[in-house]
């Protein structure tokens, strides 16, 4: 008996060939011996089965001895053994129809779980193997669960259902709603304008929701809201902005915030939260601001940084074109009685300069 696997909603063709390449009488029946379709004279006739309105045959191939049955818009309950009667012989084809669907909306927030459920005919024992767009392989039986979706899980998932050494492939498009980056750090000299950008890792035709940037300044005892906003069809409108600092926000996506100037009291870390309408949960992106200040006061040249820096970062004071350097894995370095000239303050990570500020030391007479 031949086994054919089909996909719910799809079309399947069950083949039946006569030994002689000519038009002859044939019938397709189900396991209950109920006629589905056949030939009478030169015409296709249909029997009283449930399939009659969805079953057809390729008339153009009859004179070649091909008497296939095409079933459209497959249902799980179409799974059955079908019998083709031609030239006094019977050919049996077992059709197994499977369906694979996501248990919820296919637009899911990062961190949420995805469950794929396999619909299968009674008595079957299929196995399912799914491959994510990022190459992650997940195996299961009737259900496949991905407990925590990541950004890279966005895209087309390819799932293969296997039964009796036969396979059928399903493709499911999953959109993971997330920001492109989980975290970003902006390094700025004191007084410079700061640009924060929060690009999304997905596109939706209608994007509506609301959000807030909540900020914990390093020098502040508690965190506070810097800005709240609404998003209506990709248009951004500010709801409330704190008076200090007075942030500005772009009216279009990607979400874009401008801090007029970087000051030590603003250095710290923030969390931009975005709630999308009709979605449970929220999108988050962490943003850090590191501010550098180089100052000369009397005989002391100081360079300081504020904000979240890793302990492995190096802060250096260096006299241009000279070897004089002082370096520390600290948030402040200083030189007493510095030589006259252009000094550079550098914040670096394994030799890569993240931030620099120049200060001119004039000779004291």
């Amino acid at each position: 008996k031949k086994v054919v696997l089909g996909k719910k909603g799809d079309t399947v063709e069950l083949t039946c060939n006569a030994s002689q390449k000519k038009n002859t009488q044939f019938h397709w029946k189900n396991s209950n011996q109920i006629k589905i379709l056949g030939i009478q004279g030169l015409f296709l006739t249909k029997g009283p089965s449930k399939l009659s309105d969805r079953a057809d045959s390729r008339k153009s191939l009859w004179d070649q001895g091909c008497f296939s049955m095409i079933i459209k818009n497959l249902k799980i309950e179409d799974s059955d053994t079908y019998i083709c009667e031609v030239e006094n012989k019977k050919e049996e084809v077992e059709l197994l129809v499977f369906g694979l669907t996501a248990n919820s909306d296919t637009h899911l927030l990062e961190g949420q779980s995805l469950t794929l459920t396999l619909e299968s005919p009674p008595g079957s024992s299929p196995s399912v193997k799914c491959r994510s767009p990022g190459g992650k392989n997940i195996q299961g039986g009737r259900t496949i669960s991905v407990p925590q979706l990541e950004r890279q899980d966005s895209g087309t998932w390819t799932c293969t259902v296997s039964q009796d050494q036969k396979t059928v492939e399903f493709k499911i498009d999953i959109v993971v709603l997330a920001f492109q980056k989980a975290s970003s750090t902006v390094y700025k000299k004191e007084g410079e304008q700061v640009e924060f950008s929060f690009p999304l890792a997905f596109t939706l035709e209608k994007l509506t929701g609301s959000g807030e940037l909540w900020w914990q300044a390093e020098r502040a005892s508690s965190s506070k809201s810097w800005i709240t906003f609404d998003l209506k069809n990709k248009e951004v409108s500010v709801k409330r902005v704190t008076q200090d600092p007075k942030l500005q926000m772009g009216k279009k996506l990607p979400l874009h915030l401008t801090l007029p100037q970087a000051l030590p009291q603003y250095a710290g870390s923030g969390n931009l939260t975005l709630a999308l309408e009709a979605k449970t949960g929220k999108l988050h992106q962490e943003v850090n601001l590191v501010v550098m200040r180089a100052t000369q006061f009397q005989e002391n040249l100081t360079c300081e940084v504020w904000g979240p820096t890793s302990p492995k970062l190096t802060l250096s004071l260096k006299l241009e074109n000279k070897g004089a350097t002082v370096s520390k894995q600290a948030k402040a370095v200083w030189v007493l009685n510095p030589e006259a000239g252009m000094w550079q303050c550098l914040l670096s990570d394994s030799g890569q300069v993240l931030l620099e500020s120049n200060i001119k030391v004039v000779p004291t007479w």
């Epitope: 509506t208 929701g209 609301s210 807030e212 909540w214 502040a220 508690s222 506070k224 809201s225 709240t228 609404d230 709801k239 409330r240 704190t242 008076q243 200090d244 939260t273 709630a275 309408e277 449970t280 949960g281 929220k282």
Partner: antibody, heavy 119, light 106 residues
Framework: EVQLVESGGGLVQPGGSLRLSCAAS????????MSWVRQAPGKGLEWVAN????????YYVDSVKGRFTISRDNAKNSLYLQMNSLRAEDTAVYYC????????????WGQGTLVTVSS | IQMTQSPSSVSASVGDRVTITCRAS??????LAWYQQKPGKAPKLLIY???SLQSGVPSSFSGSGSGTDFTLTINSLQPEDFATYYC?????????FGQGTKVAIK
Amino acid sequence: EVQLVESGGGLVQPGGSLRLSCAASGFTFSSYWMSWVRQAPGKGLEWVANINEDGSEKYYVDSVKGRFTISRDNAKNSLYLQMNSLRAEDTAVYYCVREGGQWLALDYWGQGTLVTVSS
Amino acid sequence: IQMTQSPSSVSASVGDRVTITCRASQGISSWLAWYQQKPGKAPKLLIYAASSLQSGVPSSFSGSGSGTDFTLTINSLQPEDFATYYCQQANSFPWTFGQGTKVAIK
């Protein structure tokens, strides 16, 4: 520790005036919007008014517009509610509230002061 | 914006799951908070942004919804949870509260 302490409540005749005060401590008062919320005896909560950090923006519920004035003195860490032309329906416990929660939530509340308008 | 809470009161036992709904007369996105008030005390913030738990609030409390329909769920009612609960919108002025739901001991 954030603390909000209301004062100035009491018994007043219809048409009379009263000034409520709220002393704030434990946070940078000048960095937050503040609100007044009231609750009539045995009834639900009703937001009355709010004011931004420097006092340049003020909003009121329709039923008190033109009669109540919200103000603040950041130097004194104080919030005020001047209530004029008082009516019997203004009888309530008045709460001083900080709008410091995430997503504009009202995160800290005073213990309330009772205002009774009766002849 | 009018906020309508239901039910206005509910009788429940310790360990029960209690669900309170709040409906806004127009869309308020996620600008919704839930408060708990005990007799003679000031209200206390439980949930902000429709579903985010305020720091220090037990995880037995949860919120959901966006737009016009919102829900507060108390998963396993504790003796200290018998109180009145209010929803409040912060989408547009004037801020408005629901009429309250009293959770009483059965």
